[in-house]
């Protein structure tokens, strides 16, 4: 669809005469009828295919054509057509003069034709005009012509349909050939669909509008790039959505159970040495000088009884001085002026000679010790309790008093409170500092499994497309993790892909 | 050939919500070269287009409706359906689901056989 | 919001031609489509992008769009022919139906 443009520029007719070569009374009133048809190598009369157009009384004898669009587009003449332009065309320009105010063909005499011009060739679609200038022995006729394509037809020959349009049926504005051209922002076949945001994640992001970028489910951050980690995940990360790998040192389901206690919180003082013994349990190996659990008690070099025979410690600030009884002397009083005529040998010790008599040996009973039997054995000074158990001496023996959660003869033993399987249906146990957690399977809650609630959520194979279906735990629902090329909460969607 | 058939009650009481289903068979609804779309027309009145969905799941609804139109799609049974919220007697009407193409600027050119649902209590 | 005009009717002689046209503000700018409905009948898609025939549909039916007014021309009309019909066309994201001329052919 387009239109054939004729513009006509002057006419010179200086005698004023017709075709004939009789004069025009008074003077030549100048019509013009054209005719656009299809190329002829010889111009003939006939039908007028591509369409004909008349204009007014454009002047007497000889005159120049003003431009005018505007009165019912006169000058130029428009000659719409409803085909496919063809690139050839055969023009016929007659003027002719008009005695009355009748211009049909059939009331004009038929020797009121002025002149006839015929002309052909090619034309290609453009926005040039071609400028001519057809001579006759009276007459002159200058003019120019052009064909372009008509609102919304686009290429070489107007042939193209396109109209810009900016909805969900297409955004774009049509080019020269009459091809799309995608607004900003918009790609595919008819520019429907949008360019997402710069560096979202091709199979785990999506969009609906230019620039944006939504993540599939599973998935979250600008570029959707980052996995959602397991509901209630505490310490631990994911590499695909719904994981919960556990950082060092922490373990369990939801990564929440310490297993670095010694690490996270530091609890040995004094630059002891801290070692893991288990959940949320440790052991302080203590510098000398120092005691306690977490070896958070300084010694006294006195605690350690340096001084043999019943002699006495007094604290020093470099050390420690060891006050000595009557027949003893020495740094620890471990050298005697006795014999056993003195009877040295305290608590039922029995005396021995030695060195011809320049020295004794006591042997001392059960319970006491010393070189004089002096001391009442303490069996707890190698600290043999384990896991902060408390030694107390009984007599010949001795016994360690546990800390909660420990047991055995050293406290060496982590009481299991899981041991006497408490979780029903099948719940799994987790020991805890001061109890214990199941963790129930689908179907069932409470402290202990105990009570049945609903079924398996992934049972009923909510998700499609070979998506992989995950139970959260904590709300008995389901989440589905799609394969690449698909989305929604059941991975029903398959995505356009450009 | 494709095909699309509408379904669901033909009787819906005032104020509750109208639900209805369209399968499509004999192609994919999950092509990229179509929107599937909902048309109503009221006995002995014209057609009034009520809203379309793509496979990805963008919507797009008349104006007039927009307050009380659900469409969305189910790729994986190759279905789409309408929900209409707190309907009235002006509702009555013969519901189509249709297929509008890309190619041919948003046109229907498949058409399901329509179903009448009557809102009366 | 978007207005599309049809006449009610239009009343055309078997093998003469019947035009019916579709009024609405810069329709030109738009594609306008044109549906054929027999009584009891789904709509059936008889132009799309002003002027195109879909396969299956007779050539005498044609369109043309310009200016604010499409039309839907149907050269040699036939009693088949009689049904209503329908002008439609995109106003940003919505659908616009006309409200539908009833042709009969005498």
């Known amino acids: 669809s387009g239109v054939f443009q004729l513009q006509l520029q002057e006419f010179i007719n200086e005698r004023g005469v017709l075709a004939s070569g009789r004069p025009c009374e008074p003077g030549c009133r100048t019509f013009f009828r054209v005719c656009l048809k299809h190329f002829q190598a010889v111009v003939s009369p006939g039908p007028c295919t591509f369409g004909t157009v008349s204009t007014p009384v454009l002047g007497t004898n000889s005159f120049a054509v003003r431009d005018d669009s505007s009165g019912g587009g006169r000058n130029p003449l428009q000659l719409p057509f409803n085909f496919t332009w063809p690139g050839t065309f055969s023009l016929i320009i007659e003027a002719w003069h008009a005695p009355g105010d009748d211009l049909r063909p059939e009331a004009l005499p038929p020797d009121a034709l002025i002149s006839k011009i015929a002309i052909q060739g090619s034309l290609a679609v453009g926005q040039n005009w071609l400028l001519d200038e057809q001579t006759s022995t009276l007459t002159r006729l200058r003019y120019s012509y052009r064909v372009i394509c008509s609102d919304n037809y686009y290429g070489d020959n107007c042939s193209r349909l396109c109209k810009k349009r900016n909805d969900h049926f297409g955004h774009y504005v049509c080019q020269p050939d009459g091809n799309l051209s995608c607004l900003p922002g918009w790609t595919g076949e008819y520019c429907q669909q949008p360019i997402c945001l710069s560096g979202c994640h091709e199979q785990n992001g999506y969009c609906s509008k230019p620039a944006e970028c939504l993540c599939r489910p599973g998935w979250q951050g600008r570029l959707c790039n980052e996995c959602i980690p397991h509901n209630g995940c505490r310490h631990g990360t994911c590499s695909t959505p719904w994981q919960c790998t556990c950082d060092e040192g922490w373990g369990g389901l939801f990564c929440d159970q310490d297993l670095n206690y010694c690490t996270h919180h530091s609890p040995c003082k004094n630059g002891a040495t801290c070692s893991n013994s288990g959940q949320r349990s440790y052991t302080c190996t203590c510098r000398p000088g120092y005691t306690g659990v977490d070896c958070e008690l300084e010694l006294s070099e006195c605690d350690s009884n340096p001084c043999r025979n019943g002699g006495s410690c007094k604290d020093q600030e470099d050390g420690y001085h060891c006050l000595c009884p009557p027949g003893y002397y020495g740094l620890h009083c471990e050298h005697s002026t006795l014999s056993c005529a003195d009877s040295p040998c305290f608590n039922g010790g029995s005396c021995r000679e030695r060195n011809q008599g320049a020295n004794y040996a006591c042997e001392c009973p059960p319970n006491f010790t010393g070189s004089n039997c002096e001391k009442k054995v303490d069996r707890c000074t190698s600290n043999p309790c384990a896991n902060g158990g408390q030694c107390l001496n009984r007599g010949p023996s001795r016994m360690c008093r546990c800390r909660p959660g420990f047991t055995g003869t050293y406290c060496e033993l982590h009481v299991s409170d899981c041991a006497r399987n408490p979780c029903a249906h099948g719940g799994t146990c987790h020991d805890l500092e001061n109890g214990l957690m199941c963790t129930c399977p689908a179907g069932f809650s409470g402290r202990r499994c105990e009570v049945r609630t609903s079924i398996d959520a992934c049972a009923s194979s909510p998700c499609f497309n070979r998506a992989t279906c995950y139970t959260d735990l904590s709300t008995d629902t389901f989440v589905c993790n799609c394969p690449y090329g698909f989305v929604g909460s059941r991975c029903e969607f398959p995505v356009g892909l450009p | 050939e494709v095909q699309l058939q509408e379904s669901g009650p033909g009787l819906v009481k005032p104020s509750e919500t109208l639900s209805l289903t369209c399968t499509v068979s004999g192609g994919s609804i999950s092509s990229s070269s179509y929107y599937w779309g909902w048309i109503r027309q009221p006995p002995g009145k014209g057609l009034e287009w009520i809203g379309d969905i793509y496979y990805t799941g963008s919507t797009y609804y008349n104006p007039s409706l927009k307050s009380r139109v659900t469409i969305s799609v189910d790729t994986s049974k190759n279905q789409f359906s309408l929900k209409l919220s707190s309907v009235t007697a002006a509702d009555t009407a013969v519901y189509y689901c249709?297929?509008?193409?890309?190619?041919?600027?948003?046109?229907?050119?498949?058409w399901g056989q329509g179903t009448l649902v009557t809102v009366s209590s | 919001s978007y207005e599309l005009t049809q006449p009610p009717s239009v009343s055309v002689s078997p093998g003469q031609t019947a035009s019916i046209t579709c009024s609405g503000q810069r329709l030109g700018d738009k594609y306008a489509s044109w549906y054929q409905q027999k009584p009891g009948q789904s709509p059936v898609l008889v132009i799309y992008e002003d002027s195109k025939r879909p396969s299956g549909i007779p050539e005498r039916f044609s369109g043309s769009n310009s200016g604010d007014t499409a039309t839907l021309t149907i050269s040699g009309t036939q009693p088949m022919d009689e049904a209503d019909y329908y002008c439609q066309a995109w106003d940003r994201d919505t659908g616009v139906f006309g409200y539908g001329t009833k042709v009969t052919v005498l």
């Open positions: 249709a297929r509008q193409a890309l190619a041919m600027g948003g046109g229907s050119d498949k």
